[in-house]
Interface confidence: medium
C-alpha cells in the first residue's frame, strides 16, 4: 500500500511480488519524487485499490503499456 | 549496480554467422527485455530487435527477421543475438541493452563485428 | 515504422551555450521518446526519457519538451562534457526507432 508522507507527497516502501490482470487494472501514476525512497508506480485496480508496484518489472510496464494506448489510441 | 558484458571483437566471412553474447549482472533478467541495437561505422542506432527471457518471446524489427534470432539463458543471466547470412553492411557494433518499455537505460561496452572477404 | 527526423544532423556551439535539437515523428507517438548522448568509443547514454523524466545522474541542465510529433532536448548551459552526439528515439510501438544524430562540436 502506499503511504502519504505528507498531503502532497505519496510514496511506496514496498512492491507487491503479485502479478495484477491487466483486466483488474484502472490506472497509474509514477512516483518520481526525490522524497521517496524509491521510484514506483501505483496502480488503481477497477475496485479502487491502490497497489504499490515496481516499474523497472516488466509486467508493470507492460501494464503501463497497455493502460496509456487503451486511453491515447482512438477508439474506432 | 547493472552491468552488461559483451563478448570480444568478430571478424567473419561474407555468408557466415556472428553470435554475439551479452552477460548480465545487477538484474534479475527473466524480470525485463533484453534488447540489440546495431551501429555502422558513422551512422545512426539501429533497432533489430528483443528477447523477453521468462518466455523466450522474441519481437524483431521486420527488416532483420529470419536473418537474426535473439536467445536467453536466465541460468547465467546471458542474452545472445546471432546474425546469419553476414554481408558487408552488417558491419558495425552490436550492442546489448537492458529495455525499460522500449527504451534502454543500460547498455553493454558493445561488440564490433567486421564482415570481410 | 515511425520514421523520426532529427534536426540539426550537427551544430557548433561555445561553453555556456543554450542549444537545442529537435526531432519529428512521422506520427503521434504520445511522449513515448527518449533522448540519449554518445560520445565516440562509447555506448549510448540515457537522458530522458517519457514527457520529462531525467534518468539519475543526468544534470539538470537537460530538459526535454514537446508533445504529439514534436519533440525538444535543450541542454540549458553547454558544458565542455557535453559536446557529444545526441539521439531521439521513440517507443510507441515497434520497431523502435532512432534519429539520424545530431553532433554537436565546438565553435
Known amino acids: 500500500q502506499p503511504d502519504a508522507i505528507n498531503a502532497a507527497v505519496t510514496c511506496c516502501y514496498n512492491f507487491t511480488n503479485r502479478k495484477i490482470s491487466v483486466q483488474r487494472l484502472a490506472s497509474y501514476r509514477r512516483i518520481t519524487s526525490s522524497k521517496c525512497p524509491k521510484e514506483a508506480v501505483i496502480f488503481k485496480t477497477i475496485v479502487a485499490k491502490e497497489i504499490c508496484a515496481d516499474p523497472k518489472q516488466k509486467w508493470v510496464q507492460d501494464s503501463m503499456d497497455h493502460l496509456d494506448k487503451q486511453t491515447q489510441t482512438p477508439k474506432t | 549496480q547493472v552491468q552488461l558484458v559483451q563478448s570480444g571483437a568478430e571478424v567473419k566471412k561474407p555468408g557466415s554467422s556472428v553470435k554475439v553474447s551479452c552477460k548480465a549482472s545487477g538484474l534479475t533478467i527473466s524480470h525485463t527485455y533484453m534488447h540489440w541495437v546495431r551501429q555502422a561505422p558513422g551512422q545512426g542506432l539501429e533497432w533489430m530487435g528483443r528477447i523477453d527471457p521468462d518466455n523466450h518471446n522474441t519481437k524483431f524489427d521486420p527488416k532483420f527477421q529470419g536473418r537474426v534470432t535473439i536467445t536467453a539463458d536466465t541460468s547465467t543471466s546471458t542474452a545472445y543475438m546471432e546474425l546469419s547470412s553476414l554481408r558487408s553492411e552488417d558491419t558495425a557494433v552490436y550492442y546489448c541493452a537492458r529495455g525499460v518499455f522500449g527504451f534502454f537505460d543500460h547498455w553493454g561496452q558493445g561488440t564490433t563485428v567486421t564482415v570481410s572477404s | 515504422d515511425i520514421q523520426m527526423t532529427q534536426s540539426p544532423s550537427s551544430l557548433s556551439a561555445s561553453v555556456g551555450d543554450r542549444v537545442t535539437i529537435t526531432c519529428k515523428a512521422f506520427e503521434d507517438i504520445y511522449n513515448r521518446r527518449a533522448w540519449y548522448q554518445q560520445k565516440p568509443g562509447k555506448a549510448p547514454k540515457l537522458l530522458i526519457h517519457g514527457a520529462t523524466s531525467l534518468e539519475h545522474g543526468v544534470p539538470s541542465r537537460f530538459s526535454g519538451s514537446g508533445s504529439g510529433t514534436d519533440y525538444t532536448l535543450t541542454i540549458s548551459s553547454l558544458q565542455p562534457e557535453d559536446f557529444a552526439t545526441y539521439y531521439c528515439?521513440?517507443?510507441?510501438?515497434?520497431?523502435?526507432?532512432f534519429g539520424g544524430g545530431t553532433k554537436v562540436e565546438i565553435k
Open positions: 528515439q521513440q517507443f510507441w510501438s515497434a520497431p523502435y526507432t
